[in-house]
Interface confidence: low
Amino acid sequence: EEELQVIQPDKSVLVAAGETATLRCTATSLIPVGPIQWFRGAGPGRELIYNQKEGHFPRVTTVSDLTKRNNMDFSIRIGNITPADAGTYYCVKFRKGSPDDVEFKSGAGTELSVRAKPSAPVVSGPAARATPQHTVSFTCESHGFSPRDITLKWFKNGNELSDFQTNVDPVGESVSYSIHSTAKVVLTREDVHSQVICEVAHVTLQGDPLRGTANLSETIRVPPTLEVTQQPVRAENQVNVTCQVRKFYPQRLQLTWLENGNVSRTETASTVTENKDGTYNWMSWLLVNVSAHRDDVKLTCQVEHDGQPAVSKSHDLKVSAHPKEQGSNTAAENTGSNERNIY
């Protein structure tokens, strides 16, 4: 009588993560009597996947009813496949023995490869804000994909970026892989509304890539420009001086007026106006009583923006001349002082 053969007809099976893998196995004879077991891997370290005789294997179901007489189909299904399930599976026939069953014959093995989708890319930017013209780095990470081949692209407002470095780990064989990419982006003053996008394409995504985004509003700091101007007279001895704070982001800003170096008033930007590019404008004014001053008055508008060193702009107010004859901005300076005000 012909000796029993264990046939695994599929050399390899490719399954998407989350799906069910069918591993086929048939025997050519009912003799010798004894159970079938499925293992992943070979040798002493092999892992038991299914034992027809005993045990409990929630993810494994048999294709046919193994308890029925004359059954020679020992195919199994493994549900909810993950990349960790990848490997070579062997269908092994045992011969009934005492006290233990003895391994009789093994199939040639079926290699299970798992296609796993990459996780949604996570984009993270620098910890601290940076100003226009500076180069900042963004990282993009995606994990858990298989096979290893993957494509990553970076975009800024729809325009593809070229200055980036990408690594896929691990370098060798693995059940799943991770990708890490760092892109360098040069900031411009118009970037408050800009977005950086990391796009990952993989065979499991069927042409519909995954995207992760970062808003440059979280990264950029646009420092303000200051302009101090003298307004027409409001009353005989009063001059109205305004400080225009333009094109700044984020909104956090504190302004201090100094008269001849002495703090006159401090205020925090509240009712700002927003520009189309996302930056803000704000105006503060100071009413100066000229008759209270003997000499010329140096008015300074000092601004501390987003915790940065203060910048200032000054305006000389000549008290010797009649207020109505005052010119606008007769003398102005941008000190860019490093001193922080103590409010």
Partner: antibody, heavy 124, light 107 residues
Framework: QVQLVQSGAEVKKPGASVKVSCKAS????????MVWVRQAPGQGLEWMGI????????SYAQKFQGRVTMTRDTSTSTVYMELSSLRSEDTAVYYC?????????????????WGQGTTVTVSS | DIQMTQSPSSLSASVGDRVTITCQAS??????LNWYQQKPGKAPKLLIY???NLETGVPSRFSGSRSGTDFTFTISSLQPEDIATYYC?????????FGGGTKVEIK
């Protein structure tokens, strides 16, 4: 002895997030799955999700998808469960529990060790 | 998701009585069913796994059985310390759903 020690009670406002920790001791942390189960006042047990401390892979109940994140720190044998966008109906006792097993089990046989529970109150 | 229908939701019995709780699965879950005991203010405790296996250290008055998708949990002789809520749970398919619970009280 084998035990799971959870972080203390939390009071949160609607819309906020909460992160509960569960520190394992007395066994090999990476050899057993960890699950999170919650129990609203006077209600039954609700399975939230499972994490494999070895690789960090997770599976969440559909109900919590997008709001729950389970992570682990193998250096401290601690798992974490973060629930975001909290609402009043998330007020509950949150338990971590170890999944025991034997032989080859895809999802082992049951939760044989439990944390003491962390009460999370969501109130405006 | 697999639905686990547990009944009754509560029961009252005398010390020494035989108490039976049932749990029905919405689909075939093999023997993959556990029973837990939860006392007020405490975490649940695993009593029975794989439908009928007693967890180490659990008294032998607790038992479990299966018939198809119907599972039965029995306390052969109710003791005062058995006052608790009992839950079934399937452990074969994620999410690992629980039954609604049965509160057991002493008459």
């Amino acid at each position: 002895q084998v035990q799971l020690v959870q972080s203390g009670a939390e009071v949160k406002k609607p819309g906020a997030s909460v992160k509960v920790s569960c520190k394992a001791s007395g066994y090999t942390f990476t050899s057993y799955y960890m699950v999170w189960v919650r129990q609203a006042p006077g209600q039954g047990l609700e399975w939230m999700g499972i994490i494999n401390p070895s690789g960090g892979s997770t599976s969440y109940a559909q109900k919590f998808q997008g709001r729950v994140t389970m992570t682990r720190d193998t250096s401290t044998s601690t798992v974490y469960m973060e629930l975001s966008s909290l609402r009043s109906e998330d007020t509950a006792v949150y338990y971590c529990a170890r999944e025991g097993g034997y032989g080859y089990r895809a999802y082992p046989y049951g939760m044989d060790v439990w944390g003491q529970g962390t009460t999370v109150t969501v109130s405006s | 998701d697999i639905q686990m229908t547990q009944s009754p939701s509560s029961l009252s019995a005398s010390v020494g009585d035989r108490v039976t709780i049932t749990c029905q699965a919405s689909q075939d879950i093999s023997n993959s069913l556990n029973w837990y005991q939860q006392k007020p203010g405490k975490a649940p405790k695993l009593l029975i796994y794989d439908a009928s296996n007693l967890e180490t250290g659990v008294p032998s008055r607790f038992s479990g059985s299966r018939s198809g998708t119907d599972f039965t949990f029995t306390i052969s002789s109710l003791q005062p310390e058995d006052i608790a809520t009992y839950y079934c749970q399937q452990v074969i398919i994620l999410p690992l759903t629980f039954g609604g619970g049965t509160k057991v009280e002493i008459k």
